[in-house]
Interface confidence: low
């Protein structure tokens, strides 16, 4: 005389944040009254109570106050449970246990799901790509559930399976962020597609990236520039070296040479149609016209300014083309520091004095070091400020606060990190009077 309890065979699929109904029904006999009904919903595995109806009354939710029965339908045998604001943690099996005179139970599965976002694609490296370069394409899709299936394919729809690494990470809500990384060697050009599939929702989210390297795989012009930055003093002239290897029979009529700022692509200087097109950069640039035919595409930059600092691209086109970027690092030496003392008279051991070390018109920002007469570094109570003027040159002011001993020497060293140039000043305080050492 067991009671027949019916639930759906297939799992109930519910989206995170929505409400789900776990259907459960029984067949009440004639004359059945709710006073006879004991209904218990529990988690199948742990037997944790979820919701119950007993002694003719809804006993309420024992599950985070997110469950409800359908009280008006109970008498007709509808024991279904409403679960509100579904979370990933709700996934699993729920048992519907019905007891009247006889009893019966059945379990229904809740499958939680969340759609994945449209994937975002990133490329590393993402510029100056050449056929033959190894690139890393990352496909990222967020806040889905359950774990995704990720597929990569090329522009012809051919699956790419080698050198793919996919990681999936759950957040506090249990939703997954998926990151899939494909490493490929570029051909002449190519499209790479990433498809993120939610296996429960059968929802596919795709994105693709098309990479067109800058040139064909063969016959590129090899452009050579120095690896290290070119260091130039403010106000002097700098040569940004760039060279290429001209083939036999090369003539300047074939040459297109463009110097531009790497970041902004602003034109700096060009040589096209067999002639020097001149400076497009404040009339402070020049080529070496007599050396061009031998493959010397270097650029002379006159009266260097702080604002010139940065990367310059040398772009050479004959039949094929190539380019390379050279960095210009601007520098200016710092002046010999001047030292001032506050207060500067009637000094006694135990007095607190403020020693200011000032050095002017340097670039880039300085490193400042203080030490005492024994060469011991002084780091406490030092405040250093650096202020750029309209030319971008820095004035540095470093303030040391010390308590005087019987006497003492305090040295300040202002270092230009690019020029590795050190400028020093020092002050010797001998109780009373105080002396500055003579200028070196």
């Amino acid at each position: 005389g067991a009671l027949e309890v019916q639930v759906p065979e297939d799992p109930v699929v519910a989206l995170v944040g929505t409400d789900a109904t776990l259907c459960c029904s029984f067949s009440p006999e004639p004359g059945f009254s709710l006073a006879q009904l004991n209904l218990i919903w529990q988690l199948t595995d742990t037997k944790q109570l979820v919701h119950s109806f007993a002694e003719g009354q809804d006993q309420g939710s024992a599950y985070a106050n997110r469950t409800a029965l359908f009280p008006d339908l109970l008498a007709q045998g509808n024991a279904s449970l409403r679960l509100q604001r579904v979370r990933v943690a709700d996934e699993g099996s729920f048992t519907c246990f019905v007891s009247i005179r006889d009893f019966g139970s059945a379990a229904v599965s809740l499958q939680v799901a969340a759609p994945y976002s449209k994937p975002s694609m990133t490329l590393e490296p993402n510029k100056d790509l050449r056929p033959g370069d190894t690139v890393t394409i990352t496909c990222s899709s967020y806040q889905g559930y359950p774990e995704a299936e990720v597929f990569w394919q090329d522009g012809q729809g051919v699956p790419l399976t080698g050198n793919v690494t996919t990681s999936q990470m759950a957040n506090e809500q249990g939703l997954f962020d998926v990151h899939s990384i494909l490493r490929v060697v570029l051909g002449a050009n190519g499209t790479y597609s990433c498809l993120v599939r939610n296996p429960v929702l059968q929802q596919d989210a795709h994105s693709s990236v098309t990479i067109t390297p800058q040139r064909s795989p063969t016959g590129a012009v090899e452009v050579q520039v120095p690896e290290d930055p070119v260091v130039a003093l403010v106000g002097t002239d700098a040569t940004l070296r760039c060279s290429f290897s001209p083939e036999p029979g090369f003539s300047l009529a074939q040459l297109n040479l463009i110097w531009q700022l790497t970041d902004t692509k602003q034109l700096v200087h060009s040589f096209t149609e067999g002639r020097d097109q001149g400076s497009a950069y404040a009339n402070r640039t020049a080529l070496f016209p007599d050396l061009l035919a031998q493959g010397n595409a270097s650029l002379r930059l006159q009266r260097v300014r702080v604002a010139d600092e940065g990367s310059f691209t040398c772009f050479v086109s004959i039949r094929d083309f190539g380019s390379a970027a050279v960095s210009l690092q601007v520098a200016a030496p710092y002046s010999k520091p001047s030292m001032t003392l506050e207060p500067n008279k009637d000094l006694r051991p135990g007095d607190t004095v403020t020693i200011t070390c000032s050095s002017y018109r340097g670039y880039p920002e300085a490193e400042v070091f203080w030490q005492d007469g024994q060469g011991v570094p002084l780091t406490g109570n030092v405040t250093t400020s650096q202020m750029a003027n309209e030319q971008g040159l820095f004035d540095v002011h470093s303030v040391l606060r010390v308590v005087l001993g019987a006497n003492g020497t305090y040295s300040c060293l202002v270092r230009n990190p690019v020029l590795q140039q050190d400028a020093h000043g020092s002050v010797t305080i001998t109780g009373q009077p105080m002396t500055f050492p003579p200028e070196a």
Epitope: T134, T165, R183, A188, P217
Partner: antibody
């Protein structure tokens, strides 16, 4: 200037494991690939595997799968190689080298591993 | 895996001579994109390897022009036009066309 510096020499017993480090400077660590290469005394070079720190992506030479585990710490610009179940065959100099799309352009000085009871 | 063979193990030379070091691969090193990823490294005693030539014939920055590389398919040669004392050491060829990357056994350039 790009620098690649490995950890110091190691003397370990057979069956033990060891973790070598490789600290780099003067380039964007996350966006480069670091490889490990093995060289037994008086012998050739064997590529072990590589790590791409941005996504902790690793690729291994099949011969070293299960033997070597590569990891990276982006905050310290350091790559690590964990070598397990050591035998005398693992005694070698291990180099860390930066992979520059086609080739290894900067190499560390090498770290000597001696496995001996 | 691709096997890189470098005969002979040792190549005795006189300073100022032309030295020629060969390398053969068990399969063509021409990638499907048309590029051949064959490189040469020099390892001096007690040092790490240093890149000399990449993609068959391209000199790496700072490498003197007395070094030149040539070859195609499976057969490659590194030439040193006038050997200097600082060129002595072990020369390795290496391929990065086929995964995993592999190296030759090395050829030791030493004085006669």
């Amino acid at each position: 200037e790009v620098q690649v510096v490995e950890s110091g020499p190691e003397l370990v017993k057979p069956g033990a494991s060891v973790k070598m480090s490789c600290k780099t400077s003067a380039y964007t660590f996350s966006d480069s690939v670091l490889s490990w290469v093995k060289q037994r005394t008086g012998q050739g070079l064997e590529w072990i595997g590589e790590i791409y720190p941005r996504g902790n992506v690793t690729h291994y030479n099949g011969k070293f799968k299960g033997k070597a585990t590569l990891t990276a710490d982006k905050s310290s610009n350091t790559a690590f190689m964990h070598f397990s179940s050591l035998t005398s065959e693992d005694s070698a100099v291990y180099f860390c080298a930066r992979w520059n799309n086609f080739f290894f352009d900067y190499w560390g000085q090498g770290s000597t591993l001696t496995v001996s009871s | 895996d691709i096997v890189m063979t470098q005969p002979p193990l040792s190549l005795p030379v006189t300073l100022g001579d032309l030295a020629s070091i060969s390398c053969r691969s068990s399969q063509s090193l021409v990638h499907s994109n048309g590029i051949t990823y064959l490189h040469w490294y020099l390892q001096k005693p007690g040092q790490s390897p240093k890149l000399l030539i990449y993609k068959v014939s391209n000199r790496f920055s700072g490498v003197p022009d007395r070094f030149s590389g040539s070859g195609s398919g499976t057969d490659f040669t590194l030439k040193i036009s006038r050997v200097e004392a600082e060129d002595l050491g072990v020369y390795f060829c290496s391929q990065s066309t086929h995964f995993p990357w592999t190296f030759g056994g090395g050829t030791k350039l030493e004085l006669k």
